[in-house]
Interface confidence: low
């Protein structure tokens, strides 16, 4: 079943390569188990950036080597992606699945365009 | 008379606060004197950033204290805006006027969203 997911149109990564945005879903029911997946679309290729399943009211747990971290609050997921470089600029799509209890719901946002600018190297200290 | 002006939708300023974009106009005739104005729209306020009048085939000359520089080639103007900070993020609109010979033509682009990220300060050198 389809579900509406909202996310900001544009976000700028910080000069440290960190971008944060909120992914909000219109929950049709009281889900206790939610999975959030971040997909990156660039040059018509879609790749998965990270994914986490969480019990509502608990923290999101991404894999240890994930570039994502996040927190949840009600129907909002606050996502942070780290280690971004200019080449990572692209459309980051938030996919939300209400896994439990049934029925299963799927929602896909329109994407957040994340812009990343590589910093200038600092001059060597003498 | 109205004239079509094209400019990119989005440009990222470099970490040094420099943003460049091309403003192209569909000249209905052979203008010898062209005026280019860059306007910034943010929070529904429109302010003038810089302006230059040039003879086709010659360099654009902005005022000495201007944050803009530029070159022209045919119906294209290559604009560079310097000294940008994160607070300068906004929509930069290219306005082109064909001043001479008559008839006068005016064209306004849809704007280029320039995103600016302030760099992290470099660590103090000991």
């Amino acid at each position: 079943k389809a579900m509406h997911v909202a996310q900001p149109a544009v976000v700028l990564a910080s000069s440290r390569g960190i971008a944060s945005f909120v992914c909000e879903y219109a929950s049709p029911g009281k889900a206790t188990e939610v999975r959030v997946t971040v997909l990156r679309q660039a040059d018509s290729q879609v790749t998965e950036v990270c994914a986490a399943t969480y019990m509502t009211g608990n923290e999101l747990t991404f894999l240890d080597d994930s570039i994502c971290t996040g927190t949840s609050s009600g129907n909002q997921v606050n996502l942070t992606i780290q280690g971004l470089r200019a080449m990572d600029t692209g459309l980051y799509i938030c996919k939300v699945e209400l896994m439990y209890p049934p029925p299963y719901y799927l929602g896909i946002g329109n994407g957040t365009q994340i812009y990343v600018i590589d910093p200038e190297p600092c001059p060597d200290s003498d | 008379k109205a004239m079509h002006v094209a400019q990119p939708a989005v440009v990222l300023a470099s970490s040094r606060g420099i943003a460049s974009f091309v403003c192209e106009y569909a000249s209905p005739g052979k203008a010898t004197e062209v005026r280019v104005t860059v306007l910034r729209q943010a929070d529904s306020q429109v302010t003038e950033v810089c302006a230059a009048t040039y003879m086709t085939g010659n360099e654009l000359t902005f005022l000495d204290d201007s944050i803009c520089t530029g070159t022209s080639s045919g119906n294209q103007v290559n604009l560079t805006i310097q000294g940008l900070r994160a607070m300068d993020t906004g929509l930069y609109i290219c306005k082109v006027e064909l001043m001479y010979p008559p008839p006068y033509y005016l064209g306004i682009g849809n704007g280029t969203q320039i995103y600016v990220i302030d760099p992290e300060p470099c660590p103090d050198s000991d």
């Epitope: 998965e48 019990m55 894999l63 209890p101 029925p103 | -």
Partner: antibody, heavy 123, light 107 residues
Framework: QVQLVQSGAEVKKPGSSVKVSCKAS????????MHWVRQAPGQGLEWIGV????????TYNQKFKGRATLTADKSTSTAYMELSSLRSEDTAVYYC????????????????WGQGTLVTVSS | DIQMTQSPSSLSASVGDRVTITCRAS??????LAWYQQKPGKAPKLLVY???TLGDGVPSRFSGSGSGTDYTLTISSLQPEDFATYYC?????????FGGGTKVEIK
């Protein structure tokens, strides 16, 4: 101990319907999902759908949507799977299976299974 | 739908052999994978979940590994009771599909 006991074998005509039951015991029926899986003779396993007995919420495999109906009776701790408009390719063993306790977020597993119900569709 | 491709479809082995069965998903399933053993006329039995966690009462000769799209079930020393058909299943997004099965036969 946990048990899932299914109804007996059925022989059905093409175009008819069959309703298979699965009686659960040894655990709290409403604490676990009930999934349905089928296996055609000599073939692999195919997931049909899942019902949450507590809420009645259902997720179907799109392949079976419109033909399969999952229900659950909390008072008797029994789950049902009805399949309509039967055709010969629906001949299979139909299993009910409980989804394991959600001890971890990854624990999407079917830990206990019924003995299976053979449904034969033949004219 | 996510396709689960199991290989080999069948294999012959002897008691004591090390047996490896692989399962490849058509997309990343993030360890949301279970392995089952099925003997003729019986219901499947859970062996492994979370790609590598053994089910209750499953002998330690069984192990699961893998990540992303590629997963493996290993039987370190095949026993007579291990001759059966093995299935993988993902739980990443519905429908939760199974692999085609691997039949382990006596050589």
């Amino acid at each position: 101990q946990v048990q899932l006991v299914q109804s007996g074998a059925e022989v059905k005509k093409p175009g008819s319907s069959v309703k298979v039951s699965c009686k659960a015991s040894g655990y709290t029926f409403t604490d676990y999902e009930m999934h349905w899986v089928r296996q055609a003779p000599g073939q692999g396993l195919e997931w049909i759908g899942v019902i949450d007995p507590e809420t009645g919420g259902i997720t179907y495999n799109q392949k079976f949507k419109g033909r399969a109906t999952l229900t659950a009776d909390k008072s008797t701790s029994t789950a049902y799977m009805e399949l309509s408009s039967l055709r010969s390719e629906d001949t299979a063993v139909y299993y009910c299976t409980r989804r394991g306790a959600r001890a971890t977020v990854y624990n999407y597993v079917m830990d206990y299974w019924g003995q299976g119900t053979l449904v034969t569709v033949s004219s | 739908d996510i396709q689960m491709t199991q290989s080999p479809s069948s294999l012959s082995a002897s008691v004591g052999d090390r047996v490896t069965i692989t399962c490849r998903a058509s997309e990343n399933i993030h360890n949301y994978l279970a392995w089952y053993q099925q003997k003729p006329g019986k219901a499947p039995k859970l062996l492994v979940y979370n790609a590598k966690t053994l089910g209750d009462g499953v002998p330690s000769r069984f192990s699961g590994s893998g990540s992303g799209t590629d997963y493996t079930l290993t039987i370190s020393s095949l026993q007579p009771e291990d001759f059966a058909t093995y299935y993988c299943q993902h739980f990443w997004s519905t429908p939760w599909t199974f692999g085609g099965g691997t039949k382990v036969e006596i050589k």
